[in-house]
């Protein structure tokens, strides 16, 4: 019996087609992805093949103005239109709190939404009961396929799930649910979830009875043969893991941003054992036409976005200096504003020991692309912010050793004076450079804001200590020459859309007046 699994993950609000790098589509003839194009391909496969499942491994939420405006209603609407069979919850589905998940998505989706390792307690338990499930038995042709869901247990540190959801260890939570499916004589089981490729592989290895793992969160690109675009494969598709009980378990993921549609064909024997698995992600490029009815629907929903981008978010009573002449040479107040917003966006999990789990931000000055003049009545709009942060990136959470941070700050000024983009703006950090010293030895003082303290204060950076830092995904991926971050980071979790982070902060503060205050000397 043959099953075709079509899968997406980490789509992050890319409802419209995008450029090759998943930013705003400029030249339509070279654009990719989007739900209208995805629908064309999905329908083509559904017509050609008998047993097809369309699955999403989480993080539909967060990433473009679509999510900012529609807050998840757009996800439910267009996933319903594409007739997804099931979705696993990702960490970003909790970005607007539990209510922001329940109302727009859980109550509106026509397909089951899954996670076995999220347990509700207190008053939320009855409110959310039945809106998401640990597993689903999906009838496909004359057979049934069990799907078990899972979500990153780090979600409380990455999003806003509140205090009434407990995120258990994925493997511990999945095993009893898989055992139940086996009891029901469901012998073909897919683990669908959002914990990253390393955890996906562990699930394949450790959870008895799981036949296939369809993952997300780490934006992993797998491919067999010559890759069709810029993404470099992290391994073959499917990636085969040998389980502890000796089975060959295919593990797949489909990069991110709706650029590819994962396509996996699995052949099962009559006892539900995987006989063979093969496939590849399908690049959704312009050779695949956009479905006209979905495209028309997208255009209808678009109207509200254009109106939103010119509305006032808040006011500034000072000039927001985002000029390259400032931000690539010295501390600039636009850099301070953005870093403050980045930290504010990550305020969660205070307890008796920690006032917050992260206090530090770094931001390449070259990523700040425009100032905002306060003389326009002080008004700040989404449009203004899109000029400051035009690349459609995210502000991510990483864990780094102090020694890596020190290298990053040395790199920040290794060729100072040439108006290069690597000069770092900061938050929760005081850095002193001596530019008379030779490159690689210019950081003379590097103090960082404590987190394990009731009164935050600046302490010298410790080389062997592990620190959490918020930074643009561009830096996490080694951009502007920050190879040491990419090579030495201990953990990387993707965060929220950059403009969204700053716009939310400005809306919250209402009036802003960021200063240059001696963070960089």
């Amino acid at each position: 019996w043959e099953l075709t699994i079509l899968h997406t993950n980490d789509v992050h609000s890319r409802l419209e087609q995008t450029s090759e790098d998943s930013s705003k589509c400029v030249n339509a003839s070279r654009c990719m992805g989007g739900v209208a194009r995805l629908f064309t391909k999905v329908q083509q496969i559904r017509r050609a093949e008998p047993n097809v499942l369309l699955l999403d491994a989480g993080d539909q939420y967060q990433g473009t103005i679509w999510f900012t405006v529609y807050k998840g209603a757009e996800v439910a609407h267009f996933m319903n239109a594409l007739r997804y069979d099931a979705m696993a919850l990702g960490n970003h589905e909790f970005d607007n709190g539990v209510e922001g998940l329940i109302e727009p998505l859980l109550k509106e989706a026509k397909f089951p939404i899954l996670s076995a390792n999220i347990k509700a307690k207190g008053p939320l338990a009855s409110q959310i009961s039945g809106l998401y499930l640990p597993y689903k038995v999906l009838p496909v042709g004359d057979e049934v396929v069990g799907i078990v869901g899972y979500t990153s247990k780090e979600t409380p540190f990455l999003s806003n799930p509140g205090t009434n959801l407990v995120f258990e260890d994925e493997i511990t939570a999945l095993q009893p649910e898989v055992d139940k499916l086996k009891t029901l004589n469901v012998n073909k089981i897919i683990a669908l979830g959002h914990s990253g490729f390393e955890t996906d592989k562990l699930i394949a290895q450790k959870v008895r009875g799981v036949d296939v793992v369809v993952g997300g969160h780490s934006n992993t690109f797998l491919y067999t043969g010559n890759p069709p675009s810029k993404e470099v494969p992290a391994g073959k598709y499917p990636f085969i893991v040998t389980s502890d009980d000796g089975r060959k378990v295919p593990v797949v993921q489909a990069y991110a941003f709706g650029k590819y549609l994962g396509y996996l064909k699995i052949e099962f024997d009559e006892r539900g054992n995987v006989i063979s698995s093969h496939g590849n992600p399908i690049l959704l490029n312009s050779s695949i036409p956009e479905d006209p009815s979905i495209k028309a629907d997208i255009n209808k929903w678009r109207i509200k976005l254009d109106n939103y981008s010119t509305q006032e978010l808040g006011k500034t009573i000072v000039y927001l200096d985002g000029s390259s002449q400032s931000c690539r040479f010295r501390e600039c107040n636009m850099g301070n504003l953005i870093c403050d917003a980045m930290i504010n966006n990550n305020l969660r999990h205070a307890d008796e020991m920690f006032w917050n789990h992260v206090s530090m931000c770094i931001l390449n000055g070259g990523g700040i692309r425009s100032p905002i003049d306060e003389r326009n009545n002080g008004t700040i709009t989404w449009e203004n912010l899109a000029a400051v942060l035009p690349f459609g990136g995210t502000f991510d959470l990483v864990q780094l050793k102090g020694s890596t941070l020190k290298k990053a700050f040395e790199h920040s000024v290794h060729r100072y004076g040439q108006s290069t983009g690597e000069f770092l703006q900061v938050g929760g950090i005081h850095v002193v450079y001596d530019l008379s010293r030779k490159p690689g030895d210019r950081v003379v003082k590097l103090d960082v804001l404590c987190t394990k303290c009731r009164v935050p204060s600046y302490d010298p950076l410790k080389m062997d200590e592990i620190y959490k830092v918020i930074l643009p995904n561009f830096l996490a991926n080694g951009g502007d020459g920050f190879q040491m971050i990419k090579d030495e980071l201990l953990r990387h979790d993707s965060g929220d859309q950059d403009i969204n982070v700053v716009s939310t902060y400005i809306s919250k503060m209402k009036v802003i007046y960021p200063a240059v205050e001696g963070r960089i000397k």
Partner: antibody, heavy 119, light 107 residues
């Protein structure tokens, strides 16, 4: 809250067919199986089959295969059970039901529809 | 088909009594067993699923146990509203089947 509202009682002649409806409310219809169970007068319960409104797949108890047809109208959030070639043995209360977790017990029941087959 | 045999078929008990109903399966069904309560003229109500998990809103005097072929439903202290017929059901193998029922009457 989850509710399943069934159509009213029916009296049918032997050899005829009957179609019982079950309107669901209080939840997303396409996300849960609808099960059909019958209970003959003074007897126990008998499972007829299920339909998954998400993709209209069905499963029948072999005893009813060929005579029972399960369908669903997602736009009306309504499931239907049609039973053909009726005999007096089919006189029973017919229930639709829904689960909490797939297959694992019928948590929500309709009020039942009495079908009487009599010449 | 898997046969489920409940015992006893009838049971007379008083308020406050501890009542145990057993359900034997003709072949193993692991823990894929549910228990229902039905009162005359009403639809059945789910009490227990997965052999021992109480359904939402079911009083904790009701408990289920067992696996494989032998299952029990226990009412720790019988209340006036508990007089009804109780059915077990297996959902491990098709066709899903029910026990013949146990009627709990007032002594």
């Amino acid at each position: 809250q989850v509710q399943l509202q069934q159509s009213g009682a029916e009296v049918k002649k032997p050899g005829a067919s009957v179609k019982v409806s079950c309107k669901a409310s209080g939840y997303t219809f396409t996300r849960y199986y609808i099960y059909w169970v019958r209970q003959r007068p003074g007897q126990g319960l008998e499972w007829i089959g299920w339909i998954y409104p998400g993709n209209f797949n069905t499963k029948y108890n072999e005893k009813f295969k060929g005579r029972a047809t399960l369908t669903a109208d997602t736009s009306a959030s309504t499931a239907y059970m049609e039973l053909s070639s009726l005999t007096s043995e089919d006189t029973a209360v017919y229930y639709c039901a829904r689960d909490v977790y797939d297959y694992a017990g019928f948590a929500y029941w309709g009020q039942g529809t009495l079908v009487t087959v009599s010449s | 088909d898997i046969q489920l045999t409940q015992s006893p078929s009838f049971l007379s008990a008083s308020v406050g009594d501890r009542v145990t109903i057993t359900c034997k399966a003709s072949q193993g069904v692991a823990t894929a067993v549910a228990w229902y309560q039905q009162k005359p003229g009403q639809s059945p109500k789910l009490l227990i699923y997965w052999a021992s998990t109480r359904h939402t809103g079911v009083p904790d005097r009701f408990s289920g146990s067992g696996s494989g072929t032998e299952f029990t439903l226990t009412i720790s202290s019988l209340q006036p509203e508990d007089f009804a017929t109780y059915y077990c059901q297996q959902y491990s193998s098709y066709p899903w089947t029910f026990g013949q029922g146990t009627k709990v009457e007032i002594k």
